[in-house]
């Protein structure tokens, strides 16, 4: 995932007697946490991998892009970033490979120029509803945020809640309303099975839709048509075995979108001769002539693009008077 | 450094086309969108659209679908932008200009500038 | 489209002097405004943007705010080299659009 860069600006590494007894004063201008790496000049903060357990108190009021990748701060708690004076011009955050497991209600609060998040790569075990939104306010006030990134951040099976992962995220990326005015939104390598049926005509502002690596079955009763302005759509490496016509014409409505499916597992059996009809006068589709088959047997490594109706049949279903037990 | 480098000025015929490019240097090519601007004569910036050069996804300007086509080329670092049944119109210098992030839509570095002149 | 009306088309002013440029937006933009100044036959560069924030490498010297759908950009203390264009720029939906510019010049 795209991260805040930094420029070259050279950094200063804090030094080792800077501990954090002061940090419930205002942090002086030049001041650079312990186990960080400081550029003023860059605006950037860099603590990465420096088994930190919680996100320094003293970090510099004029940080822009601050890194805190390869930790180890398991809890995200409210408040995670507030300091008096605030950070008013953070803009981009990353976490990713933190081994954060929890992230409370109000973690990224006091953060008025967050635009964007990168949370990839944490066994997000329990994400609050409330972590983006802040408030749990029905409509709460609108998040700053344009891009967020939330790549591989599934926890391993024996840690999940009983519940459903995918309601968890999509629970908190509708809260409030908060997220309104997000962009760009990452969500690849997450085991989904299914994507939540009104999760994405509460994002309206999307251009930027990545849902690849997943285990996406199917889309049929997900609606793409509040999406007027998606610009891509990521749906590479799931488990999709046909689009259906209600999907297809959704799609093909979008004015700018550009949709990615390499590596799905396509059935090519009758069910599938409206999705190569679609492909074949299609623009929308991105690598279209590397579609292939993988079921049934007969079919596998076929080209879609180069499928016939002849070719698309469905065993017939035998009547319940001649099946045999 | 972060730096934007364009292609040289253009004189074509009316009706003609003309590509122009965007060589980046000093970042990852794919982090950020590249956005193009015109600006005539003693007028202002106008917005043409842009290119995403990660998928290549991107928008246009209502007003230049039909003139503008934006590509990107991963291998080479470079963000074209071309120009087709160009009139007197389009004479203008054309710039490219990088993306705070991937949507940001500010733009914090700008390339060089092509002049195209559109002349019988 | 969100129309951006900058005024005041040009200016004169001093070295030393303080000078204020603003910029209404046709709709609700929240505080995504950028600033640009441009210098004849030069590219322009980004000065602020999220309304307030300033780009890197910009003198304290300048500086934005704003209040609903007007925002304003100012320079404390002229300095010889911040005569030019400056524009506006919403980069809260697309399409992006510009002000029509304040040329700065020498009194």
């Known amino acids: 995932s795209s991260s805040p860069t930094s420029s070259a600006s050279s950094f200063s590494s804090s030094a080792p007697f800077l501990a954090s007894a002061v940090s419930a004063q205002p942090p002086l201008p030049d001041q650079c946490p312990a186990l960080c790496e400081c550029s003023e000049a860059a605006r950037t903060v860099k603590c990465v991998n420096r088994n930190l357990t919680e996100v320094p108190t003293d970090l510099p009021a004029y940080v822009r892009n601050l890194f805190l990748t390869g930790n180890q701060l398991a809890v995200l708690p409210a408040g995670a970033f507030a300091r008096r004076p605030p950070l008013a011009e953070l803009a981009a955050l990353n976490l990713s490979g933190s081994r954060l497991d929890e992230v409370r209600a109000g973690a990224f609060e006091h953060l008025p120029s967050l635009r964007q998040l990168d949370l990839s790569h944490n066994p997000l075990a329990d994400l609050s509803p409330f972590a983006f939104s802040g408030s749990n306010a029905s409509v709460s006030a609108p998040s700053p945020l344009v891009e967020l990134i939330l790549n591989h951040i599934v926890p391993p099976e024996d840690e999940r809640q009983n519940r459903s992962f995918e309601g968890m995220v999509v629970a908190a990326l509708l809260a409030g309303r908060a997220l309104q005015g997000l962009r760009r939104l990452e969500l690849a390598s997450n085991h989904f099975l299914y994507l939540p049926r009104d999760v994405l005509a509460q994002l309206p502002s999307l251009r930027h839709l990545d849902l690849s690596n997943n285990s996406l079955v199917s889309l049929t009763y997900v609606s793409f048509r509040n999406l007027t302005h998606l610009e891509s759509l990521h749906l590479e490496d799931n488990a999709l075995k046909v689009l259906h016509n209600g999907t297809l014409a959704e799609l093909q409505g979008l004015p700018h979108i550009r949709v990615f499916l390499d590596n799905n597992p396509w059935v090519c059996d009758c069910h599938m001769a409206d999705m190569v009809t679609w492909l074949k006068e299609t623009e929308v589709v991105q690598g279209k002539d590397r579609l292939t088959c993988a079921y049934p047997e007969k079919m596998r490594n076929r080209v879609l693009l180069e499928l016939n109706s002849a070719d698309l049949d469905c065993d017939p279903i035998l009547p319940p008077s001649l099946q045999t037990s | 450094q972060v730096q934007l480098q364009q292609s040289d000025a253009e004189l074509v015929r009316p009706g003609a086309s003309v590509k122009m490019s965007c060589k980046v240097s000093g970042y990852t090519f794919t982090d950020h969108t590249i956005h193009w601007m015109k600006q005539r004569p003693e007028q202002g910036l106008e917005w043409i659209g842009y290119?995403?050069?990660?998928?290549?996804?991107?928008t246009y300007n209502e007003k230049f679908k039909g003139k503008a086509t934006l590509t990107a080329d991963k291998s080479s670092s470079t963000a074209y932008m071309q120009l087709n049944s160009l009139t007197s119109e389009d004479s203008a210098v054309y710039f490219c200009?990088?993306?705070?992030?991937?949507?940001?839509?500010?733009?914090?570095?700008w390339g060089t500038g092509t002049t195209v002149t559109v002349s019988s | 489209d969100i129309q951006m009306t900058q005024s005041p088309a040009s200016l004169s002013a001093s070295v030393g002097e303080t000078v204020t440029i603003t910029c209404r937006a046709s709709?609700?933009?929240?505080?995504?405004l950028a600033w640009y100044q441009q210098k004849q036959g030069k590219s322009p560069q980004l000065l602020v943007y999220n309304a307030k924030t300033l780009a890197e490498g910009v003198p304290s010297r300048f500086s934005g705010s704003y209040s609903g759908t007007q925002f304003s950009l100012n320079i404390n203390s002229l300095q010889s080299e911040d005569f030019g264009i400056y524009y506006c720029?919403?980069?809260?939906?697309?399409?992006?659009?510009f002000g029509a510019g304040t040329k700065l010049d020498l009194k």
């Open positions: 720029q919403h980069h809260h939906d697309t399409p992006l659009t």
């Open positions: 709709e609700i933009i929240y505080n995504y």
């Open positions: 200009a990088r993306d705070g992030s991937s949507h940001y839509w500010y733009f914090d570095v």
């Open positions: 290119i995403y050069p990660r998928d290549g996804s991107g």
